[in-house]
């Protein structure tokens, strides 16, 4: 039975040209995390494999950085980066857990969000 839950940064906003950290956390399960995939609308951004480490999609390698932890840092944001992001935790023996984050990239300094997950 899948008992775990995913906590995410939820709905977040950031300024165009800036950076943002996407974070998910899996709790309430003793399942082993074998891999975490980060996707944006069915496009694979990055993989963190427990055995082989981080792999960043060649399409995003200039704007995506691994971490911190199992999170993902998006850099040089554009308005086209607005949308849904998913952290997909592949675990054993539970199976797959998915978290959702909605990112809105704003044109000006009207982006407001707690500094905990934002890089100045």
């Amino acid at each position: 039975m899948m008992t775990g839950t995913i906590e995410t940064t939820g709905n977040i906003s950031a300024e165009k040209g800036g950076s943002i950290i996407l974070q998910c956390h899996l709790s309430s399960t003793t399942a082993q995390v074998t891999q975490v995939n980060w996707e944006q609308q069915d496009q694979l951004l990055a993989i963190c494999n427990a055995d082989l480490g981080w792999h960043i999609s060649p399409s995003f390698k200039d704007r995506v950085a691994p971490g911190p932890g199992l999170g993902l840092t998006l850099q040089s944001l554009t308005v086209n980066d607005t949308g849904e992001y998913f952290c997909i935790y592949h675990t054993y023996p539970d199976g797959t857990y998915t978290g959702r984050i909605f990112l809105e990239v704003l044109e000006s300094s009207v982006a407001e969000h707690g500094a905990r997950f934002q890089i100045p």
């Epitope: 996707e39 993989i47 082989l52 390698k61 592949h90």
Partner: antibody, heavy 121, light 108 residues
Framework: QVQLVQSGAEVKKPGASVKVSCKAS????????MHWVRQAPGQGLEWMGI????????SYARKFQGRVTMTRDTSTSTVYMELSSLRSEDTAVYYC??????????????WGQGTMVTVSS | EIVMTQSPATLSVSPGERATLSCRAS??????LAWYQQKPGQAPRLLIY???TRATGIPARFSGSGSGTEFTLTISSLQSEDFAVYYC??????????FGGGTKVEIK
């Protein structure tokens, strides 16, 4: 040209170990993942594991964990797959296959010719 | 693990006809799917990667489509050398990377 050449057929007794080699040529050996896949007679393809030839990092299918060891020798561009505690169900053709670059993921574009391992008492 | 299911298990087709092979993933693999061809006594050969990109040297009669969980390999006009077993494979989540059970394309 790019190719993978595997060692010859083996006949082993139950409980023994086998070590199959796969020598790569024609490309930058450390830059691409190497996988091992096996195929029992008349059956489909079964992934066993992967090795990063540059760092030596490995990831094994849970089914084989504790029984399989994948290593590499960068000086000879060779990867090895050792399977221990052999049983009759391990009778199969074992293939090495080149995967994607170690910076990303990819399909298996180059395959070895296969090594037949027969386990019989 | 991601389970790959191929259908049909066997496909009987006449030379010159079109063959359509299906592959379904138990969860999304985006476009990280490959198709391989295997003839008796030979190692598999990569046909398609990225769900729809032909590998080097693969004839244009082979085409792949789909994304997410549903994928198709189409052979537009079967040649005698195309009768073989075809496998799909996801290569985005490991361990383990997983193959479908295969579709045997035989002469009708």
């Amino acid at each position: 040209q790019v190719q993978l050449v595997q060692s010859g057929a083996e006949v082993k007794k139950p409980g023994a170990s086998v070590k199959v080699s796969c020598k790569a040529s024609g490309y930058t050996f450390p830059a691409y993942y190497m996988h091992w896949v096996r195929q029992a007679p008349g059956q489909g393809l079964e992934w066993m594991g992967i090795i990063n030839p540059s760092l030596g990092l490995t990831s094994y299918a849970r089914k084989f964990q504790g029984r399989v060891t994948m290593t590499r020798d960068t000086s000879t561009s060779t990867v090895y797959m050792e399977l221990s505690s052999l049983r009759s169900e391990d009778t199969a053709v074992y293939y090495c296959a080149r995967g994607g670059r170690t910076t990303w993921i990819g399909a298996f574009d180059i395959w070895g010719q296969g090594t037949m391992v027969t386990v019989s008492s | 693990e991601i389970v790959m299911t191929q259908s049909p298990a066997t496909l009987s087709v006449s030379p010159g006809e079109r063959a359509t092979l299906s592959c379904r993933a138990s969860q999304s693999v985006s476009s990280n799917l490959a198709w391989y061809q295997q003839k008796p006594g030979q190692a598999p050969r990569l046909l398609i990667y990225g769900a729809s990109t032909r590998a080097t040297g693969i004839p244009a009669r082979f085409s792949g489509s789909g994304s997410g969980t549903e994928f198709t390999l189409t052979i537009s006009s079967l040649q005698s050398e195309d009768f073989a077993v075809y496998y799909c494979q996801q290569y985005v989540v490991w361990p383990p990377l997983t193959f479908g059970g295969g579709t045997k394309v035989e002469i009708k």
